[in-house]
């Protein structure tokens, strides 16, 4: 469905302003911050969500070893520039004319520079590793059950096609979810792994982006799965370009 017609809200993005001013009096929703129209039948892009967040009033061994090129979002929040499709622009700058290049999930992938910095293309993040630690339980979860429920979650809540959930690894209490999506695999209408990972991250933090839905309540055979920490690693189709100074710091 698009924006809920009865009370004109956006089920997939509560950081919107909605009104019945679309064609034929249909409900149309615009993202806070950017004012861009959003499709409420699917996830909103991370760029528009970050922009909306910055505009809102401030108020919180079988396991995979991330590769040497994996990025972690250490820079935190910033007010991004989004293109007309809602994607991150390859080059981001702050108010003091400090610029840097980002990948498709908005994570910095170069050293910071000045306005002369060039970012030729938006490099796609094709592999995301979500590393979770769950709270202690009476016993370990069954790996197959955990895999089934996490796949169901990404499929049902985030509408991510199962083929993009490459693997679910488990060594109690660590769970790793691998999302993979090459440019060639992503068809029109497919949810982007970066957007799904961002919605999941916000859900885990108890900051759900969905309108009116309860927070994330994940259970495996009736046993609550409560996450106590999350780390997300991003791998790009082209390795990031940082100076040796950063790498040895």
């Amino acid at each position: 469905h698009t924006a809920a017609q009865d009370n004109c809200t956006c089920p997939t993005n509560k950081m919107t302003v909605c009104s019945p001013d679309g064609p034929g009096g249909r409900c149309q929703c615009r993202a806070l911050g950017s004012g861009m129209a959003v499709d409420c039948s699917t996830l909103t892009s991370k760029c528009l969500l970050l922009k909306a967040r910055m505009s809102a009033p401030k108020n919180a061994r079988t396991l995979v070893r991330p590769s040497e090129h994996a990025l972690v979002d250490n820079d935190g929040l910033y007010d991004p520039d989004c293109d007309p499709e809602g994607r991150f622009k390859a080059r981001q700058c702050n108010q003091t004319s400090v610029c840097w290049c980002v990948n498709s999930v908005g994570v910095r992938r170069t050293d910071k520079g000045d306005l002369s910095l060039r970012c030729d293309e938006l490099v796609r993040t094709h592999h995301i590793l979500i590393d979770l630690r769950h709270r202690p339980t009476a016993g370990a979860f069954n790996h197959s059950d955990l895999d089934a429920e996490l796949r169901r979650l990404f499929r049902e809540r985030y509408r991510l096609h199962p083929k993009f959930v490459a693997a679910v690894h488990y060594e109690q209490p660590t769970i790793q979810i691998e999302l993979r999506q090459n440019t060639s695999q992503k068809a029109a209408g497919d949810v982007d792994i970066g957007d799904a990972a961002y919605y999941f991250e916000r859900d885990i933090k108890g900051e759900s982006l969905f309108q009116g839905r309860g927070g994330l309540d994940l259970r495996v055979r009736g046993e609550p799965l409560q996450v106590e920490r999350t780390l997300i690693y991003y791998l790009d189709e082209i390795p990031p370009k940082f100076s040796m100074k950063r790498l040895t710091a």
Epitope: R155, R157, A167, G214, D217, R219
Partner: antibody, heavy 117, light 111 residues
């Protein structure tokens, strides 16, 4: 022992709304799992209609989504199916079933609903 | 939607026979850990009964003469030695993708 029992009218007129209820005993529907409706037209195969989860989330078969609502009453440990604008093609045995981790381990005995004027 | 195709549609066999039913999915229903393919038995006028879950796991209380195998798109249900109570219709079901879908069924009859 988990048990599911369907109830509701056996005859519905065309264009009306079919309403069925599944009463669950032996397990609280808000404690876990996914609570499904599945149907089987006479002499035919099985068709998944949709579910309501332990937390109240819904998922429906896109082929029926515009006509289906699955809701629950946790105080009675029941979940219900509403199918609007029915036609003769909706004549079927309707089953409720529990989805454990994406397979159906417990089923109701089924109830035949005939759509006819 | 994932299309599930069972073969044969019907099968005549005798008590004591070894019987194999196959189920083919229109796309893979496996993950790195799981095979989201399940088998059910249905007798006339009764609800389906779970036999095998995740391709090869025998549901509690189901006789060991039933077994399942396969991965990806091709799966098999085997009954090692048919018993009189096994004459029924068998369905496969995938749960890798929404909507969940079932095979058209295989009717197992007495020869």
């Amino acid at each position: 022992q988990v048990q599911l029992q369907e109830s509701g009218p056996g005859l519905v007129k065309p264009s009306q709304t079919l309403k069925l209820t599944c009463t669950v005993s032996g397990y609280s529907i808000s404690s876990g799992y996914y609570w499904n409706w599945i149907r089987q037209p006479p002499g035919k195969g099985l068709e998944w209609i949709g579910y309501i989860s332990y937390s109240g989330r819904n998922l429906y078969n896109p082929s029926l989504k515009s006509r289906v609502t699955i809701s629950r009453d946790t105080s009675k440990n029941q979940f219900s199916l509403k199918l609007s604008s029915v036609t003769a093609a909706d004549t079927a045995v309707y089953y409720c079933a529990r989805d454990t981790t994406a397979y159906f381990d417990y089923w109701g005995q089924g109830t035949l609903v005939t759509v006819s004027s | 939607d994932i299309r599930m195709t069972q073969s044969p549609s019907s099968l005549s066999a005798s008590v004591g026979d070894r019987v194999t039913i196959t189920c083919r999915a229109s796309e893979s229903v496996s993950s790195s850990v799981n095979r989201f393919l399940h088998w059910y038995q249905q007798k006339p006028g009764k609800a389906p009964k779970l036999l095998i879950y995740r391709a090869s796991n025998l549901e509690s209380g189901v006789p060991s003469r039933f077994s399942g195998s396969g991965s990806g798109t091709d799966f098999t249900l085997t009954i090692s030695s048919l018993q009189p109570e096994d004459f029924a219709t068998y369905y496969c079901q995938q749960s890798n993708e929404d909507p969940y879908t079932f095979g058209q069924g295989t009717k197992l009859e007495i020869k």
